[in-house]
């Protein structure tokens, strides 16, 4: 089959007449009376149809045209290209062979962008018109006038620092300090020993070199220097005016400090939140804290607070902390963390909830309190829910037990332990899951509505009645269900039993919405219209 | 019976609450509601549910974040659909779970939503 | 999850047998918490089978539902006209790790 075959990459620059030349195989002749080849461009909003000449069965050319794409925020498109034979045969393309349109200026407005650019492309900066251009655009002829990266010696007047980041850092040094800018060389060795951030030189790190664009460098120390801020300045090669940089922002040195961490206690295991807090805490590009010489997981931090997750402690105690900033070690042996033994739990009162859960279980054990956001948690036919639990003191907590309600799975009238059941105490894996207790989950009350329509007439002063079942779990001792019956928002006094529940309605008249609670449960069962005396004895 | 309503024609983009209503009874605090859909000339696919005696709902993984079931009255349960495609042209149909068999006992006759331009 | 059904459509002769199958890419919940439905055109679905193989009331004992875990069969014995429809499975599942719920594609009978 006839196809075309790779040859050497296809670069047009937009705007310039040339033909474009490209290896094939099995071309065929075209015979009298049948139309020759063509070159199609798919260039999105101007496709390009051009005659194509064959000159053997293995070389073509397209012949001399101009090529355009809109718009100046694209730099170098890849254009698909087929060849067509006698205006409809499409010759193969099975490595799917693309011209590569470009325009210099696009995307490259300063020196440093345009020398950077594929080489390929033949871009180089037009000095006198300060624009990148092809050699032929550039219109003074000096050859100085017309700068391409093939010099070696080709360097980009007036580099510029944009920003700095970090814009502070300990004395000691150690700091990675990003400079983004333009023109900041075009090699590495072009930059290599020119950054100094006041009289303090900044080592730039190759790897992270982004020609002309970004330097990385680490400061070094500045401990001897008095002077508390300072420019950067970046010189490329020579630090003569046209070849100097200095920041608009000046670098700080500062002394990071910190006095205080909250909370300053948590369990042995770990797994604790703390905020440590003090001043310059921002400072530098890295930061590491360790508690009791283990590392605190790094969360966040601002210049007043550094926040981690404490590790596992080797035993109860005050255990040091050390902020490293960089080359800076800060420790305060007034600040202390503390690791108490890890809570216990020991028992739960009462040992059963409903399906929706919300109902109040007080739990006793000991540790309590050294976590500060306890959860109670319970997994029941796959789902898992949390709630969170108040604490008292170090022996006492008051939480709700969890919702367990999903369709696939409800508790028996006689109760169902949950699969898991257990307290979310930061790093404590033994109360994850209590296989000491018996706790037991029973399904919701069922109540019935108050009519097929939902609305239910009432006499004044006399008593609603709500029927239903489930409204006492068979639980073992004295504590039951605590329902509140509410009439519109006023609530009634209650008399539960196994199969209703009687409410003494207040002394309200009109319409009111009922509704029923029992922890997380919340259900209402209509709407109550009750007539006033005076309408009942009009004759 | 159960009874839809709310389907109407919309624009891509749109927002539409959809309404389910229990004629002749009212919820019993055990119930889950459920709302299913149809294509036209495909099959059913589950949406969410809610749970009468409480706020639990849960949702298809599809549907989480633009779908919104909820308990309004204790005879209708609505289903509020946001940011909705041509995608979402369906029969919709609200049905009643029954927790002693796990499974949809009772169902309404659908109400028809139509997204196009 | 998935529910996969046999594909559509099948064809029947009046008094004939029906089976069509569905399989669970896991198991249902309790191994049998899977249903099945007849729909036919312009009407919502009708529940004819819970919990695997439990008929629901006022529905012909010519349906028959069997199966456990994933694999599941409604076989309809001694096929009338009436039972031309669409029919579907559902199956439940552990709310917490992924859906709680899943139908099948369908699957469409014709019945001869």
């Known amino acids: 089959c006839p196809q075309i075959l790779p040859s050497t990459q296809i670069y047009v620059p937009v705007g310039v007449v040339k033909p474009i030349t490209l290896a094939a195989r099995n071309l065929p002749q075209p015979q009298s009376g049948q139309r020759g080849y063509e070159c199609l461009f798919h260039i999105p909003g101007s496709p390009a149809r051009v005659t194509a000449l064959r000159f053997n069965s293995s070389s073509l050319q397209c012949q001399n045209s101009s090529y355009s794409y809109e718009g100046n925020d694209v730099s170098d498109l890849p254009v698909n290209l087929s060849v067509v034979w006698n205006g409809n045969f499409v010759i193969d393309n099975p490595q799917n062979i693309q011209a590569h349109l470009y325009k210099c200026p696009a995307l490259r407005e300063s020196c440093g962008l345009c020398l950077k650019a594929d080489p390929r492309f033949e871009c180089g900066w037009c000095v006198a018109e300060r624009r990148c251009s092809l050699r032929h655009h550039c219109a003074a002829d000096t050859p100085a006038s017309w700068m391409h990266a093939r010099h070696g010696s080709s360097r980009c007047t007036d580099p510029k620092i944009l920003k700095l980041s970090p814009e502070t850092g300990p004395r000691q040094g150690g700091t990675r300090l990003t400079i983004t800018g333009e023109n900041l060389g075009l090699r590495f060795e072009d930059v290599r020993l020119g950054v100094r951030v006041g009289k303090v030189l900044c080592s730039p790190v190759e790897s992270e070199y982004i020609s002309a664009e970004q330097i990385v460098c680490e400061i070094g120390d500045a401990s001897s220097v008095r002077a508390h801020d300072a420019l950067v300045e970046v010189c490329v090669r020579d630090c003569s005016p046209h070849y100097r940089a200095l920041s608009p922002k000046r670098f700080t040195f500062v002394t990071p400090t910190f006095y205080r961490v909250s909370p300053s206690r948590g369990p042995l295991s770990g797994g604790t939140w703390i905020g440590i807090e003090g001043s310059h805490l921002n400072a530098g590009s890295d930061v590491a804290v360790s508690v009791g010489g283990r590392p605190c997981s790094f969360s966040w931090r601002n210049s007043r607070e550094i926040r981690c997750l404490t590790p596992p402690g080797q035993s109860p105690g005050s255990a040091p902390i050390i902020i490293n900033i960089n080359r800076a070690q800060l420790t305060n042996p007034e600040v202390k963390y503390n690791y108490t033994e890890d809570p216990t739990i020991l028992r739960i009162d009462p040992e059963w909830s409903i399906n929706s859960g919300g109902t109040l279980l007080t739990v006793t054990g000991t540790n309590l309190a050294t976590v500060r956001e306890p959860r109670i948690r319970a997994k029941y036919g796959g789902i898992e829910r949390e709630n969170g639990c108040l604490v008292y003191n170090d022996t006492t907590m008051v939480c709700r037990a969890p919702s367990v309600a999903n369709p696939v799975r409800s508790p028996p009238e006689l109760g169902e332990r949950p699969d898991e059941l257990g307290f979310v105490m930061d790093n404590v894996r033994s109360l994850l899951v209590l296989n000491s207790t018996s706790f037991l989950y029973y399904p919701d009350p069922v109540l019935e509505p108050l009519s097929p329509t939902g609305l239910l007439e009432l006499k004044p002063s006399s008593p609603l009645i709500l029927k239903g079942r489930n409204l006492l779990p068979p639980a073992p001792g004295n504590s039951r269900l605590n329902y509140t019956v509410l009439i519109g928002s006023t609530p009634c006094t209650l008399t539960v039993s196994e199969t209703q529940l009687l409410c003494e309605a207040p002394n309200l008249t009109g319409q009111h919405k009922v509704t029923v609670r029992a922890g997380g449960f919340e259900f209402s069962p209509g709407t109550l219209q009750v007539y006033s005396d005076s309408l009942l004895t009009l004759p | 019976s159960l009874e839809e309503s709310g389907g109407d024609l919309v624009k891509p983009g749109a927002s539409l609450t959809l309404t389910c209503t229990a004629s002749?009874?009212?919820?019993?605090?055990?119930?889950?509601i459920y709302w299913v859909r149809q294509a036209p000339g495909k099959g059913l696919e589950w949406i969410a549910c809610i749970y009468i005696g409480s706020d639990s709902a849960y949702y298809a993984s599809w549907a989480k974040g633009r779908f919104t079931i909820s308990k309004t009255s204790s005879t209708t349960v609505t289903l509020q659909m946001t940011s909705l495609t041509a995608a979402d042209t369906a029969t919709y149909f609200c049905a009643r779970w029954d927790n002693s068999g796990r499974a949809l006992k009772l169902w309404g006759p659908g109400t028809l939503v139509t997204v196009s331009s | 999850q998935m529910l996969t059904q046999t594909a559509s459509p099948v064809s029947a002769a009046v008094g004939g047998t029906v089976t069509i199958k569905c399989q669970s890419s896991?198991?249902?919940?309790?191994?049998?918490?899977l249903s099945w439905y007849q729909q036919k055109p312009g009407q919502p679905p009708k529940l004819l089978i819970y919990?695997?193989?439990t008929l629901a009331s006022g529905v012909s004992s010519r349906f028959k539902g069997s199966g456990s875990g994933t694999q599941f069969t409604l076989t309809i014995s001694d096929v009338q006209c009436d039972d031309a429809a669409t029919y579907y499975c559902l199956g439940n599942y552990d709310c917490g790790s992924a859906d709680c719920h899943a139908f099948g594609g369908g699957t469409e009978v014709v019945v001869k």
């Open positions: 002749g009874f009212s919820f019993s605090s055990n119930y889950w």
């Open positions: 919990f695997a193989s």
């Open positions: 896991q198991s249902v919940a309790d191994n049998n918490h």
